[in-house]
Structure formats: structure tokens, C-alpha cells
């Protein structure tokens, strides 16, 4: 037997107790599929929230954060301070890098430069507390007379030829 | 801003035909099903038809079944109320009004005289 | 359907004054019921929705009560544009309906 239930569409709520089973959608409520038993209440994206979308009858709000604040977590649950670009949050706020650790984005951790020794490289650029440092060749490709290694030329696509 | 606005009312005979519009705009008009109101001159409201959002599902109120018919075009952002074998007793201002019953339009007025 | 019946038909106060308007339901409706208000010449505007919720942009004064099937609008105070025609509808079953309307006219 089919659920009669399941003629209710997206928008509105279904009652199995009553002959009339579809009712629309309070206000600030939607159900986004039909055959539904409750209309969810809306997301209200306040204070440090913004509204992205508004709620409709069948569908949620979206919010995403303020300007100076990001999102965190699956649907933009939580909004997280941004620190400048050299700078992480911690408790007391928005902390510089140690030295020896950047941080390029105004999210997330300082993250430890990139040890270049470590793969038989030399350190090309510095690190900055924004900036990791960037690795260049080998001390051994640096030495007199090891040859310079020239790209190969790109290969010709097969197939069409000049019409 | 949202809003509602109706038109195509006006002066039909008995019997006639009319067909009204409502345009929308300010919300995701795809995303809500809407209703017909309406309001005889110096009376009460009275609920006429309502339209789900993507079309599928529709009521009507006993006065009108089988006469009156209710359409959307999401691409148009526009709801439509075909009004057919028209009485007397359908003189009134129709509004359209989005289906949390929120929003109206500011009414269009339909007359059946002869 | 279900028929609501709004008492009494017409309120004569004077601004500031208290107005108490009931909505009774024939048969339970839940906590479906809005409050609207209408003046001439214009659409209605919602006022309270699930019986009781003020809508956006609402002053205070406005306070809806009840479920099942009496229903109370209350106006704390009256404000000169207060003066209106208020409505209840029920959206618990198809159709929806309203009831015949209250009159707050001045005294």
C-alpha cells in the first residue's frame, strides 16, 4: 500500500491522523522533500553569521560569516576569527609565527618551513613567517662543472596536420 | 525586497473568461508554492487555489473547481490564474500571496457584469 | 472545511487602550493559525503566524495566544494606525480559510 504521505509535496507536511493530510509550511519552516511528517524550523544566521540564501518553503537558509571571520565545520556551523597572513588564533587571539614556521593563509596553524636538507636541497629563498622558504638544487648541481640540464622539446600532438 | 504583482483584472460578462498574472521577485520564487486569494468588495478573504513549487500539486477551493485553473512558470518567475464560465459571485480583488501566506501582492480587481 | 469564527465583529477603543480579539476554530486546528491585519484599500499583512510567533518587523505590542481551537490576538496599546480590520486563518488543512474579520475602529 502506498503512503498517502506521499503525495505531500516539498513545502508542505503530512499528517496520517487527519483525512486532509497536506498542510503548508509555516512561516520560517520548510520541508525540502516530499512525504514529510514536520516542517524544519528555519536557519536564522545571526550575529557573526550572515545569510548566503534565505530559507524558503522547501528549502534551509545557508550561512556563511562575516567579513574578517571564516567558516568552520559542514555547513558553515561555526564562524572562526581570520588572523592576518603570518599570524594563527590561539586562545588570547591571533599570535605571529615562531620563527621557523608561516602561515600564507588568515586561516589555520603556522606551519614549520620545509626542511630543503632533507631532500639534498639547498634553501634558494628564505622563510618569512608568511612565506615558506623555497628550495633550490642540490649542493652537488651547484659545483663547477656539473652540466645544466636543458628541458626536452614538447612532443607534437598526434593526429590533425596543418589543413 | 519581496514582491507580488498582480494583474490582468478587469470588466468580463457572465460566463466569460479571464486570466490572471502575478509576478514575483525578491525571493527564489522556484523554491515556494503559492496561493490565490481573494476578497469579494467589502467582504472576507477567501482561499481560491494553491500551486506547489515545482507544479506537481494543486487544490481548489469547491467554489471554483472545475472552473478555475492555476499555473506557474518558474523560468518566468510568474503565477498564472486561468478563470473560466465566470459568475457574478467572483467579483472580488485577487491576490496572490507566497505559500507561508507572508507576502501579498496588491490586488487585482476582477468585475463579472453584464 | 473548517470555519473560524472571529468575535466580536467590530471594537471601538480609543488609543492606548488594551484590544483583546478571539479566533475559535470548529474543529482542532494545532497552533496553525495567523493573525493579519488589513486597511483600506491595501493587502493583509501578517502579523503573527504558529499562533503566537510575532513575523519579522512586528512591533511587540502584538502578542498571539492559544491552540486547539480558541485563539487570542492582543494589541497592548493602541497606536493611531493600529485602527484596522484583523483577520485569523487557519493553514492546518486544505482549504485554507479566514475568519469574517474584527473591525478596531475608534471610539
Known amino acids: 500500500l502506498q503512503d498517502p504521505c506521499s503525495n505531500c509535496p516539498a513545502g508542505t507536511f503530512c499528517d496520517n491522523n487527519r483525512n486532509q493530510i497536506c498542510s503548508p509550511c509555516p512561516p520560517n519552516s520548510f520541508s525540502s522533500a516530499g512525504g514529510q511528517r514536520t516542517c524544519d524550523i528555519c536557519r536564522q544566521c545571526k550575529g557573526v553569521f550572515r545569510t548566503r540564501k534565505e530559507c524558503s518553503s522547501t528549502s534551509n537558509a545557508e550561512c556563511d560569516c562575516t567579513p574578517g571571520f571564516h567558516c568552520l565545520g559542514a555547513g558553515c556551523s561555526m564562524c572562526e576569527q581570520d588572523c592576518k597572513q603570518g599570524q594563527e588564533l590561539t586562545k588570547k587571539g591571533c599570535k605571529d609565527c615562531c620563527f621557523g614556521t608561516f602561515n600564507d593563509q588568515k586561516r589555520g596553524i603556522c606551519r614549520p618551513w620545509t626542511n630543503c636538507s632533507l631532500d639534498g636541497k639547498s634553501v634558494l629563498v628564505n622563510g618569512t613567517k608568511e612565506r615558506d622558504v623555497v628550495c633550490g638544487p642540490s649542493p652537488a648541481d651547484l659545483s663547477p662543472g656539473a652540466s645544466s640540464v636543458t628541458p626536452p622539446a614538447p612532443a607534437r600532438e598526434p593526429g590533425h596536420s596543418p589543413q | 525586497e519581496v514582491q507580488l504583482v498582480e494583474s490582468g483584472g478587469g470588466l468580463v460578462q457572465p460566463g466569460g473568461s479571464l486570466r490572471l498574472s502575478c509576478a514575483a521577485s525578491?525571493?527564489?520564487?522556484?523554491?515556494?508554492?503559492m496561493h490565490w486569494v481573494r476578497q469579494a468588495p467589502g467582504k472576507g478573504l477567501e482561499w481560491v487555489a494553491y500551486i506547489s513549487s515545482g507544479g506537481s500539486t494543486i487544490y481548489y477551493a469547491d467554489s471554483v473547481k472545475g472552473r478555475f485553473t492555476i499555473s506557474r512558470d518558474n523560468a518566468k518567475n510568474s503565477l498564472y490564474l486561468q478563470m473560466n464560465s465566470l459568475r457574478a459571485e467572483d467579483t472580488a480583488v485577487y491576490y496572490c500571496?507566497?505559500?507561508?501566506?507572508?507576502?501579498w501582492g496588491q490586488g487585482t480587481l476582477l468585475t463579472v457584469s453584464s | 472545511e473548517i470555519v473560524l469564527t472571529q468575535s466580536p465583529a467590530t471594537l471601538s477603543l480609543s488609543p492606548g487602550e488594551r484590544a483583546t480579539l478571539s479566533c475559535k476554530a470548529s474543529?482542532?486546528?494545532?497552533?496553525?493559525v495567523s493573525w493579519y491585519q488589513q486597511k483600506p484599500g491595501q493587502a493583509p499583512r501578517l502579523l503573527i503566524y504558529g499562533a503566537s510567533n510575532r513575523y519579522t518587523g512586528v512591533p511587540a505590542r502584538f502578542s498571539g495566544s492559544g491552540s486547539g481551537t480558541d485563539f487570542t490576538l492582543t494589541i497592548s496599546s493602541l497606536e493611531p494606525e493600529d485602527f484596522a480590520v484583523y483577520y485569523c486563518g487557519q493553514s492546518y488543512s486544505y482549504p485554507l480559510t479566514f475568519g469574517g474579520g474584527t473591525k478596531v475602529e475608534i471610539k
Open positions: 500571496a507566497r505559500d507561508w501566506v507572508d507576502y
Open positions: 525578491g525571493f527564489t520564487f522556484s523554491e515556494f508554492g
Open positions: 474543529e482542532n486546528v494545532g497552533s496553525y
